[in-house]
């Protein structure tokens, strides 16, 4: 998977008028990674492994950073021209990678009211904009006061992507991101599933980075893809990840079955356990 | 730590019968089923089927159907192989080996060795 | 049934000696395959599962590889407690099958 980096700001406005605040939150490799104190108005690590990437160093930068990118979306939202009464939001979402064969992709994308009406391929400097009329209306405002806005030229952007990516491999640079490596812990549960079955289940959390292999084997063999139920592979909140997969079996054939996980190199297999007992944990 | 221990050397006659016995230790017995395996002097090994612990139900490789029995003491950890009639060709060293997800012998016991004359 | 064939039924090496001892199979088995080692006074231990997987407490000396039907284990710097009989199984089917076992010896 590319090393990512993700800026997520939303602004508000009450009744058309823009509000002095704004949310920010950052997230390194999928990982939430920093937020905007409103309170102290300053970027604050998520964690103490976003705190260890950057070690004793200050987040001024960061801070800078953000408040100056959350003043300009409070521009753009003050020049959105169909803002009705109550509460709206405008939301940017830009993110830059870095892939293995170290190419980069840059993007940015406007939400308004939590609907997507444009994005920007940065490389290519392509605007794309949904078919929605109420979409092509906002983009086009947006469009012409970013036009009108002496500083969101082309170099503008290219910029931007270029300090996104400068920062980016900057964090790169800290071994708690390239070297990180949390191996998972592993525990497989049964539930009764109907007469005679039994589900069962294969949770993988804490590991990191995001990449896993768990799934189900029978006598040793790996099960189809279609008797098999995987959950997605999310964030747990401690800068790490968490999974599952689980599969039905009849009762009484647990000892056939097993659980088979692949994480950064190393490999571990769990069996079911029979009867009563109701969880095994392991961690290798 | 996890150990199987099997009974002790059996000298027998043709047509007589044995039961040998293999106990666990350091694991939850019916988690995992137990294997059976055979080695004649001076040869391989051949798997002879293996026992579902918790729910009791014996698999027989096609060469041991027939006069080969496993059988199980839950409450004692216990798994025993009985041979029936037996034959000059059933003397070997028998294993008792931890079914581990039914595809691996993951742990073994020390092994009977069983002797049987005409 | 499928069977598991180790052409070399015995093997002398010098200690510290690179040794492959290989296994072929009837047919292809997809990677399921142990390894197994009987020392001379008969007690066996599992090294290796799934082709390459070495198995908790193995010496990383050991090594496994292959893949369709021709496998192979490999000990990379031989030691005196490796001398012993080495055994392939194969999982891909059922009965389960060994190879006739490979003896270690030292020259």
């Known amino acids: 998977e590319p090393h990512s980096l993700r800026y997520n700001l939303t602004v508000l406005s009450w009744d058309g008028s823009v509000q002095s605040g704004f949310l920010a939150e950052v997230h390194l490799d999928g990982q939430p990674f920093l937020r905007y104190d409103r309170q102290k108005c300053r970027a604050k690590p998520q964690g103490q492994w976003a705190e260890d990437v950057l070690g004793n160093k200050t987040w001024d930068r960061e801070t800078r950073d953000l408040t100056g990118n959350g003043k300009d979306l409070r521009m753009t939202l003050a020049h959105i021209k169909d803002q009705k009464e109550g509460l709206h939001s405008l939301q940017e979402i830009r993110v830059c990678e870095i892939h293995e064969d170290n190419s980069t992709r840059s993007s940015q994308h406007f939400y308004y009211d939590g609907e997507l009406f444009l994005s920007q391929n940065v490389e290519t400097e392509e605007w794309t904009v949904p078919q929605s009329s109420r979409a092509q209306t906002l983009a086009m405002n947006v469009r012409n006061f970013l036009k009108e806005d002496a500083m969101k030229t082309k170099t503008h952007y290219h910029a931007m992507h270029a300090d996104c990516l400068q920062e980016l491999r900057r964090y790169l640079e800290s071994s708690v991101v390239l070297r990180r490596r949390v191996p998972p812990m592993v525990n497989v549960t049964r539930s009764e599933a109907s007469e005679g079955n039994i589900t069962v289940t294969c949770r993988a959390s804490s590991f990191y980075p995001r990449n896993i292999t768990l799934t189900w084997r029978q006598d040793g063999v790996s099960l189809s893809h279609d008797t098999q139920q995987w959950g997605d592979v999310l964030p747990d909140g401690n800068g790490t990840y968490q999974t599952w997969v689980a599969t039905r079996i009849c009762q009484g054939e647990e000892q056939r079955f097993t659980c088979y996980m692949e994480h950064s190199g190393n490999h571990s297999t769990h069996p079911v356990p029979s009867g009563k007992v109701l969880v095994l944990q392991s961690h290798w | 730590q996890i150990q199987l221990v099997q009974s002790g050397p059996e000298l027998k006659k043709s047509g007589e019968t044995v039961k040998i016995s293999c106990k666990a230790f350091?694991?939850?017995?019916?988690?995992?089923?137990m294997n059976w395996v055979k080695q004649a002097p001076g040869k391989g090994l051949k798997w002879m089927g293996w026992?579902?612990?918790?729910?009791?139900?014996?698999t027989y490789a096609d060469d041991f159907k027939g006069r080969f029995a496993f059988s199980l003491e839950t409450s004692a950890s216990t798994a025993y192989l009985q041979i029936n009639h037996l034959k000059n060709e059933d003397t070997a060293t028998y294993f008792c080996a931890r079914n581990y997800g039914n595809y691996l012998f993951d742990y073994w016991g020390q092994g009977t060795t069983l002797t049987v004359s005409s | 049934d499928i069977q598991m064939t180790q052409t070399t039924s015995s093997l002398s090496a010098s200690l510290g000696d690179r040794v492959t001892i290989s296994c072929s199979a009837s047919q292809g088995i997809s990677n399921y395959l142990n390894w197994y080692q009987q020392k001379p006074d008969g007690t066996l231990k599992l090294l290796i599962q799934?082709?390459?997987l070495l198995h908790s407490g193995v010496p990383s000396r050991f090594s496994g590889s292959g893949s369709g039907t021709e496998y192979s284990l490999t000990i990379s710097n031989l030691e005196p407690e490796d001398i012993a009989t080495y055994f392939c199984q194969q999982y891909s089917k059922f009965p389960r099958t060994f190879g006739g076992g490979t003896k270690l010896e030292i020259k």
């Open positions: 799934y082709t390459s």
């Open positions: 026992i579902n612990t918790y729910t009791g139900e014996p």
């Open positions: 350091g694991y939850t017995f019916t988690n995992y089923g």
